[in-house]
């Protein structure tokens, strides 16, 4: 279905918050969900091929949260 790559056409970057209003990033499923549907992360199973997050949800003030510092974002703009 494709025929040969060419130069990238960029678009303006969205705001750093990852979800549209009224949605929050769910660390278990790794995508935005309705904020009311957020679940508490479970412990990561040993040897899981699609690992569950290792961390608890925390308030999102650190947009640059690293490993072990995952955060629950407030509703944001895309």
């Amino acid at each position: 279905m494709r025929r040969g790559p060419r130069s990238l056409r960029g678009r303006d970057a969205p705001a750093p918050t990852p979800c549209v209003p009224a949605e929050c990033f769910d660390l278990l499923v790794r995508h935005c969900v309705a904020c009311g549907l957020l679940r508490t992360p479970r412990p990561k199973p040993a040897g899981a091929s699609s690992p569950a997050p290792r961390t608890a949800l925390q308030p999102q003030e650190s947009v640059g949260a690293g490993a072990g510092e995952a955060a629950l974002p407030l509703p944001g703009l895309l």
Partner: antibody
Framework: QVTLKESGPGILQPSQTLSLTCSFS??????????VGWIRQPSGKGLEWLAH???????YYNSVLKSRLTISKDTSKNQVFLKIANVDTADTATYYC??????????WGQGTSVTVSS | DIQMTQSPSSLSASLGERVSLTCRAS??????LNWLQQEPDGTIKRLIF???RLDSGVPKRFSGSRSGSDYSLTISSLESEDFVDYYC?????????FGGGTKLEIK
């Protein structure tokens, strides 16, 4: 402006290890809920997701190819790497990297062509 | 793994025509579906995310909808640049999976 660019060897031989690099700008992999994934497309065929890595170093792999895939990142250099071990002619494809956010892949690289041939 | 069955695999249509492409999910994926456009040179662009939300800069003639496990991309009035390839992508769970693609050709 978010941009991603893939680079690779172009051509390699069966049984070798394919090493791909995704160099990106306009975002950081130290940012919450950011990730980068790899997708490939054999000529004239559809898209196949391979692997992705998140800001917190969680990694996800295509279950069929998992034993041959290794994804990693260098956050300070804004780069993500994919290695595919023991390649075969079936691995001949265009390889794309893409940024991941709250709604999967939103920005894609231009693709790099890889040919496996003896 | 979740299978995404995309139809039709190819479609011939005329300028100004309204067309719809469909993807059917083998399991529940909620609204976790995107539509992608691939140009002849390989450039890939996301058009629709979360089933029905339009990406910035995408013309309003594109729209996405859902009916049960069927997801549709509709182009209300085809323009010349729309005759390219389209893919759906589910991201409800890993592994992410794509539909087989639809090649939209000019009649």
């Amino acid at each position: 402006q978010v941009t991603l660019k893939e680079s690779g060897p172009g051509i390699l031989q069966p049984s070798q290890t394919l090493s791909l690099t995704c160099s990106f700008s306009g975002f950081s992999l130290s940012t919450f809920a950011m990730g980068v994934g790899w997708i490939r497309q054999p000529s004239g065929k559809g898209l196949e997701w391979l692997a992705h890595i998140w800001w917190d170093d969680d990694k996800y792999y295509n279950s069929v190819l998992k034993s041959r895939l290794t994804i990693s990142k260098d956050t300070s250099k804004n780069q993500v790497f994919l290695k595919i071990a023991n390649v075969d002619t079936a691995d001949t494809a265009t390889y794309y990297c893409a940024r991941l956010g709250g709604y999967a892949m939103d920005y894609w690289g231009q693709g790099t062509s890889v040919t496996v041939s003896s | 793994d979740i299978q995404m069955t995309q139809s039709p695999s190819s479609l011939s249509a005329s300028l100004g025509e309204r067309v719809s492409l469909t993807c059917r999910a083998s399991q529940d994926i909620g609204n976790n579906l995107n539509w992608l456009q691939q140009e002849p040179d390989g450039t890939i662009k996301r058009l629709i995310f979360a089933t029905s939300r339009l990406d910035s800069g995408v013309p309003k003639r594109f729209s996405g909808s859902r009916s049960g496990s069927d997801y549709s991309l509709t182009i209300s009035s085809l323009e010349s640049e729309d005759f390219v390839d389209y893919y759906c992508l589910q991201y409800a769970s890993s592994p992410y999976t794509f539909g087989g693609g639809t090649k939209l050709e000019i009649k």
